[in-house]
């Protein structure tokens, strides 16, 4: 004969554990019945009666089965330099990532806590390693023979054109100028954009125009180029 | 207000190991990139090494390549030096900087106020 | 690695001098050249970026100028807390080496 399937609540049989969806309710030592993603537990089970689950309220979640007493509430707002990528919803948490042009600088466990804007490298520099979600673009100087006349944290040093005759040479920041009209070949087309990165950990020593980064955040920097601008927090 | 305080500087025999830890505060710390520089006495300046916000990129002086590593802990606003194989010629104050912005904004703007490491037998 | 050579290495000037430092590159550098203003028992403190920014607090009695590979701060009217030693250092390729320094001394 097989064997009767309990319904919740039941005590289980010494040394075994409840069911899948189930838990054990130390007070009524019963196993009773989890409330779905969506609910919470409205009132615990009882010796003789089970759980009694409630949906979630407007703005509070939960993701799992579970038996909490209060659904979760969601994460606040996504702030100015962030996206939404998941709304708030009776089972699933509001995920906030950092728009294009930032990357993530401090991470939470879903989503991002600081966003700041990606580092522009200044003319003479070019992107060595494009910026991602979750880390800032890496600069290096142009090295001879290229140059980088922009303030971008897209644009890579690009060759210096090849000229019949040079009026002025190229330098990191500048491009070859020639004085026949045209020049044999153009190595330089327009603006070149480093292609998605390989995210790789690197140890440079660069003694060869090798990347090198620095803060792309604009905020507590008092002068100059200002480096980071401040990124704002998702909480 | 900007703060860089060293710590883990002392006496130690040549050959031996330090590791130096820089607290940082007063600013989003993992956006910005730090290095190391030293002094030693009656000397100038000299770079030693360089992170960048992520602690992707690393750059070392030739002097201390192979032998120091620098690190960060983005979750505990703190920047480190570890040094190995030290040598009486690495007796110096060693000062935790802010910055370069590299490729962006070059220039150390913040020092903390240093701590000692002498090498010595 | 580029070499800097910062001149003099040592000057005495009284209160109200003009006072020229000069740092000399073995390449160009793309005025990507910073001061410092360095006290006895205290780290350096940002004087100069860009090789003719003013720094965030720094007086205007302060200014640098120059490009390529050579480079100038000048200090229009020397101050008594002005007595210091001076250092420029490159931001192009690593390593990223400081001038020797100059001392300012009163005379």
């Known amino acids: 004969l097989p064997a009767q399937v309990a319904f919740t609540p039941y005590a289980p049989e010494p040394g075994s554990t409840c069911r899948l969806r189930e838990y054990y309710d130390q007070t009524a030592q019963m196993c009773c019945s989890k409330c779905s993603p969506g609910q919470h537990a409205k009132v615990f089970c009882t010796k003789t009666s089970d759980t009694v689950c409630d949906s979630c309220e407007d703005s509070t979640y939960t993701q799992l089965w579970n038996w909490v007493p209060e659904c979760l509430s969601c994460g606040s707002r996504c702030s100015s330099d962030q996206v939404e990528t998941q709304a708030c919803t009776r089972e699933q948490n509001r995920i906030c990532t950092c728009r294009p042009g930032w990357y993530c600088a401090l991470s939470k466990q879903e989503g991002c806590r600081l966003c700041a804007p990606l580092r522009k490298c200044r003319p003479g520099f070019g992107v060595a390693r494009p910026g991602t979600e979750t880390s800032d673009v890496v600069c290096k100087p142009c090295a001879p023979g290229t140059f980088s006349n922009t303030t971008s944290s897209t644009d890579i040093c690009r060759p210096h054109q090849i000229c019949n005759v040079v009026a002025i040479p190229g330098n990191a920041s500048m491009d070859a100028v020639c004085t026949s009209t045209s020049p044999t070949r153009s190595m330089a087309p327009g603006a070149v954009h480093l292609p998605q990165p390989v995210s790789t950990r690197s140890q440079h020593t660069q003694p060869t125009p090798e990347p090198s980064t620095a803060p792309s955040t604009s905020f507590l920097l008092p002068m100059g180029p200002s480096p980071p601008a401040e990124g704002s927090t998702g909480d | 207000e900007v703060q860089l305080v060293e710590s883990g500087g002392g006496l130690v025999q040549p050959g031996g190991s330090l590791r130096l830890s820089c607290a940082a505060s007063?600013?989003?710390?993992?956006?910005?990139?730090l290095s190391w520089v030293r002094q030693a006495p009656g000397k100038g300046l000299e770079w030693v090494a360089y992170?960048?916000?992520?602690?992707?990129?690393?750059y070392y002086s030739d002097t201390v390549k192979g032998r120091f590593t620098i690190s960060r802990d983005n979750a505990k606003n703190t920047l480190y030096l570890q040094m190995n194989s030290l040598r009486a010629e690495d007796t110096a104050v060693y000062y935790c900087?802010?910055?370069?912005?590299?490729?962006?904004?070059?220039?150390?703007?913040?020092w903390g106020q240093g701590t000692l490491v002498t090498v010595s037998s | 690695d580029i070499q800097m050579t910062q001149s003099p290495s040592s000057l005495s000037a009284s209160v109200g001098d003009r006072v020229t430092i000069t740092c000399r590159t073995s390449?160009?550098?793309?005025?990507?050249l910073p001061w410092y203003q360095q006290k006895p028992g205290k780290a350096p403190k940002l004087l100069i970026y860009d090789a003719t920014k003013l720094a965030e607090g720094v007086p205007s009695r302060f200014s640098g100028s120059g490009s390529g590979t050579d480079y100038t701060l000048t200090i229009s009217s020397l101050q008594p807390e002005d007595f210091a030693t001076y250092y420029c250092?490159?931001?192009?390729?690593?390593?990223?080496?400081f001038g020797q320094g100059t001392k300012v001394e009163i005379k």
């Open positions: 250092q490159h931001f192009w390729v690593t390593p990223w080496t």
């Open positions: 390449e160009s550098i793309y005025s990507n």
């Open positions: 007063g600013f989003a710390f993992s956006t910005y990139d």
């Open positions: 992170i960048n916000n992520g602690g992707i990129s690393t």
């Open positions: 900087v802010r910055g370069p912005f590299y490729g962006s904004a070059n220039y150390f703007d913040y």
